[in-house]
């Protein structure tokens, strides 16, 4: 599945993992029907996808969550796709926001993020959410990936 | 539009089709502004995209639906992107869920699914929904496609 | 970042820009963490992405908006990805619809559109929404892009 020795395919798709950590950064695993094309992209500490080669990447994330307006803060549920590059400030690449549902006990909603970005060698991307406890981890509901153009 | 004789572009984008069938599998057609790059990807029985070559594919679906909380079951509207490979279990690749709207007669919502997956020769992908009668078939609202990396 | 002299990478990702114009066409800018691979794709008049080469493109848009059912029209918020080709009628490629929220003063929601389409030389794609004043322009919330396969 090579484009050529100098230009191998680089792609990843990882699956959400419930976590007891209080961090807002989502956790991921190489489980189920995951993709990890080769060692030019790696999942580090279960939280970020790190690339070894500079280039243009299409990066995406999908987050399904279940929340209720009364039980949640006034602020909407926000999912953010973020970038860490060596020697640079972290930055937000993409965000999506959904107001909490009035359904009881909670209403499910899904968010999809995706865009083309230039990544440097050693750059990492990760996904932040406002409340990780609301994220749905059933088969296929929440995932994260990238592909090099 | 060839990458080379041995590595042609493979891509498809098909358009939703209303169906009188009671199945939860959505129906699609090569109509409107559709894409079918060549015979290395085909639309079979109006319901599944089937690929002839092994490789990494970005697969996506968009479903717009109109539903009302009172008129629908308690369960949310769920769209699932599923995979059939010869001699393998069928499997859910991606799912998204949206709680029904309180708007009357119904409230429209759109779901987008997408991810990178390895497909085997003869593998087929299809889209399941909880209630096909709620799906919107107006121009551009509901579509399904893939591209080979 | 070339595939070869005859086959350079073509990709763009542009960022939403608030506008005082009353048009329903969203405005975009090359600002923040944008992508513009080369002059084979350009942002024209801040409103459309125009390609110089024929081929298959994955085109996407994300729109986050904040609306309230009582303060909005009965009709849902609709985002449309549209195509203009030289000497052809404009056409809708993709649409997504979300019913307005009952949250006050307004409830945020995000829409994602994406699909594979054949574009002709000189073709332009742009994004229409029902009410541009409801669009969220905070970092990462609303963006638009494409990549050539």
């Amino acid at each position: 599945m090579q484009k050529g020795d100098q230009n191998p395919q680089i792609a990843a798709h990882v699956i959400s993992e419930a976590s007891s950590k209080t961090t807002s950064v989502l956790q991921w695993a190489e489980k189920g029907y995951y993709t990890m094309s080769n060692n030019l992209v790696t999942l580090e500490n279960g939280k970020q996808l790190t690339v070894k080669r500079q280039g243009l990447y299409y990066i995406y994330a999908q987050v399904t969550f279940c929340s209720n307006r009364e039980a949640s803060s006034q602020a909407p549920f926000i999912a953010s796709l973020c970038l860490k590059s060596p020697g640079r400030f972290e930055r937000i690449l993409l965000r999506a926001a959904n107001t909490h549902s009035s359904a009881k006990p909670c209403g499910q909603q899904s968010i999809h993020l995706g865009g083309v970005f230039e990544l440097q060698p050693g750059a990492s991307v990760f996904v932040n959410v406002t409340d990780p406890s609301q994220v749905s981890h059933g088969t296929g509901f929440t995932s994260f990936g990238l592909l090099k153009l | 539009m060839q990458k080379g004789d041995q590595n042609p572009q493979i891509a498809a984008h098909v358009i939703s089709e209303a169906s009188s069938k009671t199945t939860s599998v959505l129906q699609w057609a090569e109509k409107g502004y559709y894409t079918m790059s060549n015979n290395l990807v085909t639309l079979e029985n109006g319901k599944q995209l089937t690929v002839k070559r092994q490789g990494l594919y970005y697969i996506y679906a968009q479903v717009t639906f109109c539903s009302n909380r009172e008129a629908s079951s308690q369960a949310p509207f769920i769209a699932s992107l599923c995979l059939k490979s010869p001699g393998r279990f069928e499997r859910i690749l991606l799912r998204a869920a949206n709680t029904h709207s309180s708007a009357k007669p119904c409230g429209q919502q759109s779901i987008h699914l997408g991810g990178v997956f390895e497909l085997q020769p003869g593998a087929s992908v299809f889209v399941n929904v909880t209630d096909p009668s709620q799906v919107s078939h107006g121009t551009g609202f509901t579509s399904f496609g893939l591209l080979k990396l | 970042m070339q595939k070869g002299d005859q086959n350079p990478q073509i990709a763009a990702h542009v960022i939403s820009e608030a506008s005082s114009k009353t048009t329903s066409v969203l405005q975009w800018a090359e600002k923040g963490y944008y992508t513009m691979s080369n002059n084979l794709v350009t942002l024209e008049n801040g409103k459309q992405l125009t390609v110089k080469r024929q081929g298959l493109y994955y085109i996407y848009a994300q729109v986050t908006f904040c609306s309230n059912r009582e303060a909005s029209s009965q009709a849902p918020f609709i985002a449309s990805l549209c195509l203009k080709s030289p000497g052809r009628f404009e056409r809708i490629l993709l649409r997504a619809a979300n019913t307005h929220s009952s949250a006050k003063p307004c409830g945020q929601q995000s829409i994602h559109l994406g699909g594979v389409f054949e574009l002709q030389p000189g073709a332009s794609v742009f994004v229409n929404v029902t009410d541009p004043s409801q669009v969220s322009h905070g970092t990462g919330f609303t963006s638009f892009g494409l990549l050539k396969l």
């Epitope: 190489e30 489980k31 029907y33 088969t139 | 393998r88 279990f89 499997r91 | -």
Partner: nanobody, 123 residues
Framework: EVQLVESGGGLVQPGGSLRLSCAAS????????MGWFRQAPGKEREFVAV????????LYADSVKGRFTISADNSKNTAYLQMNSLKPEDTAVYYC????????????????WGQGTLVTVSS
């Protein structure tokens, strides 16, 4: 490796019901999914139903939707296939299969298979 033992097959009249069981032993922590295939005489083995261990989500072949139900009892490490409204075309050897955990999309990992149990639907 996972060992799988099926039971519950037999002869049944059209419209009747059967319940197949598949008991797993060995490296059961390695199981991502359990399910059923069937093979009719002179035909290829075909997928029937699957249940995923992570959340119990299920999928069925079109030909059995609404008639067959797959379930699992994790405490007994057993999967079940409840078959109702049986038809003559359901006649086949039914095989239980288990898919290893973390097999990934770029690996075609080998399934573990049971020996099969014969279901005959005939009047």
């Amino acid at each position: 490796e996972v060992q799988l033992v099926e039971s519950g097959g037999g002869l049944v009249q059209p419209g009747g019901s059967l319940r197949l069981s598949c008991a797993a032993s060995g490296n059961i922590f390695r199981i991502n999914a359990m399910g059923w295939f069937r093979q009719a005489p002179g035909k290829e083995r075909e997928f029937v139903a699957v249940i995923y261990s992570s959340d119990g989500s299920t999928l069925y072949a079109d030909s059995v939707k609404g008639r067959f139900t797959i379930s699992a009892d994790n405490s007994k490490n057993t999967a079940y296939l409840q078959m109702n409204s049986l038809k003559p075309e359901d006649t086949a050897v039914y095989y239980c299969a288990a898919e290893p955990y973390g097999s990934g999309s770029s690996l075609i990992s080998e399934y573990d298979w049971g020996q099969g149990t014969l279901v005959t639907v005939s009047s």
